[in-house]
Interface confidence: low
């Protein structure tokens, strides 16, 4: 498992809530947490860091303390849309597909 980092300081405040620190690498676009160190996925996303799209669902329902909207994610033509790279990997487009740059300790096409 990747390292968990706990930060006690309140970095920003919103409605007097002290946000929790999610698992390192948890997707900022598709993940959230309710306990420190966890990474829970919005609908339509899966994987340990919520970076893998679920092909059977294209809708997402943002949850968590700052949710404001609900909508459907329509996958675009870009191979990196939704970031197919797991575990904090970084996606770059190639002519026919995508390439993941994996953080230390992770390997494979999608850093899994």
């Amino acid at each position: 498992d990747h390292h968990h980092h706990h930060h006690e300081q309140k970095l920003i405040s919103e409605e007097d809530l002290a946000p929790l620190v999610c698992r390192a690498g948890c997707s900022p676009e598709h993940g959230f947490c309710e306990q420190p160190g966890e990474c829970r996925c919005l609908e339509g996303w899966t994987g340990p860091l919520c970076t893998v799209p679920v092909s059977t669902s294209s809708c997402l329902s943002p949850r968590g303390p700052s949710s404001a909207t609900t909508g459907c994610l329509v996958p675009g033509p870009g191979p990196c849309d939704g970031n197919p790279c797991a575990n904090g990997g970084s996606c770059s487009e190639t002519p026919r597909s995508f390439e993941c740059t994996c953080p230390r300790g992770f390997y494979g096409l999608r850093c899994e």
């Epitope: 930060h7 920003i12 675009g76 033509p77 770059s92 487009e93 994996c102």
Partner: antibody, heavy 120, light 106 residues
């Protein structure tokens, strides 16, 4: 509190090299990408590249790939960008940025920027 | 490469006026992020993930859009809103910014 500290200014001569620093504090430096952004006087923002300090992995714009070198020292929580063969066109403000996120929150922290002046 | 085109490049608005700045992407992106920059200062994250206001951003700001068309709206312009606004996409490499919209107060 998440902070990125950058030197205010660097003055160098054309043809020389420069290494600018970005010292991070207040978060797990190794686990979040650092981005470098260039802004020429009166111009817009230009993405240079990203570095993942935990592994040293980098992604750079084709324009800067051969001229800018991104590195990070996890022991001092400092990211660096080094330019070689400087020209006056490299004169700009260079920002480092950390996208730090947790829960449904983004905390996108920018350094104050280093103003690089390349002049003889 | 995803090219982001902002319009207008420069605009002015009177206090209380509704303002809309658009950001058009050359191909579909998942989200757009908006930054505000005042002269001589670092850009600040203003709206993230298309529609979420960053901490401290007044509620008169809003963001919307999907696919290739995004916008930032100010319901009622105030003097402190005068600044340059940039959109950015992080869906693919290379990361790209829009050219910026300079918003002035009349």
């Amino acid at each position: 509190q998440v902070q990125l500290q950058q030197p205010g200014a660097e003055f160098v001569q054309p043809g020389s090299s420069v290494k600018m620093s970005c010292k991070a504090s207040g978060y797990a430096f190794s686990d979040y990408w650092i981005t470098w952004v260039k802004q020429r006087p009166g111009q817009g923002l230009e993405w240079i590249g990203d570095i993942y300090p935990g592994s040293g992995s980098t992604k750079s714009s084709e324009k800067f790939k051969n001229r800018a070198t991104l590195t990070a020292d996890t022991s001092s929580s400092t990211a660096y960008i080094q330019f070689s063969s400087l020209t006056p066109e490299d004169s700009a403000v260079y920002y480092c940025v950390s996208l730090y996120y947790y829960g449904s929150y983004y905390l996108d922290t920018w350094g104050q920027g280093t103003t690089l002046t390349v002049s003889s | 490469q995803v090219v982001l085109t902002q319009s207008p490049a420069i605009m002015s608005a009177s206090p209380g006026e509704k303002v809309t700045i658009t950001c058009s992407a050359s191909s579909s992106v998942t989200y757009i992020h908006w930054f505000q920059q005042n002269p001589g200062t670092s850009p600040k994250l203003w709206i993230y993930r298309t529609s979420y206001l960053a901490s401290g951003v007044p509620a008169r700001f809003s963001g919307s859009g999907s696919g290739t068309s995004y916008s930032l709206t100010i319901s009622r312009m105030e003097a402190e809103d005068a600044a340059t606004y940039y959109c950015q996409q992080r869906s693919s490499y290379p990361r790209t910014f829009g050219g910026g919209t300079k918003l002035e107060i009349k």
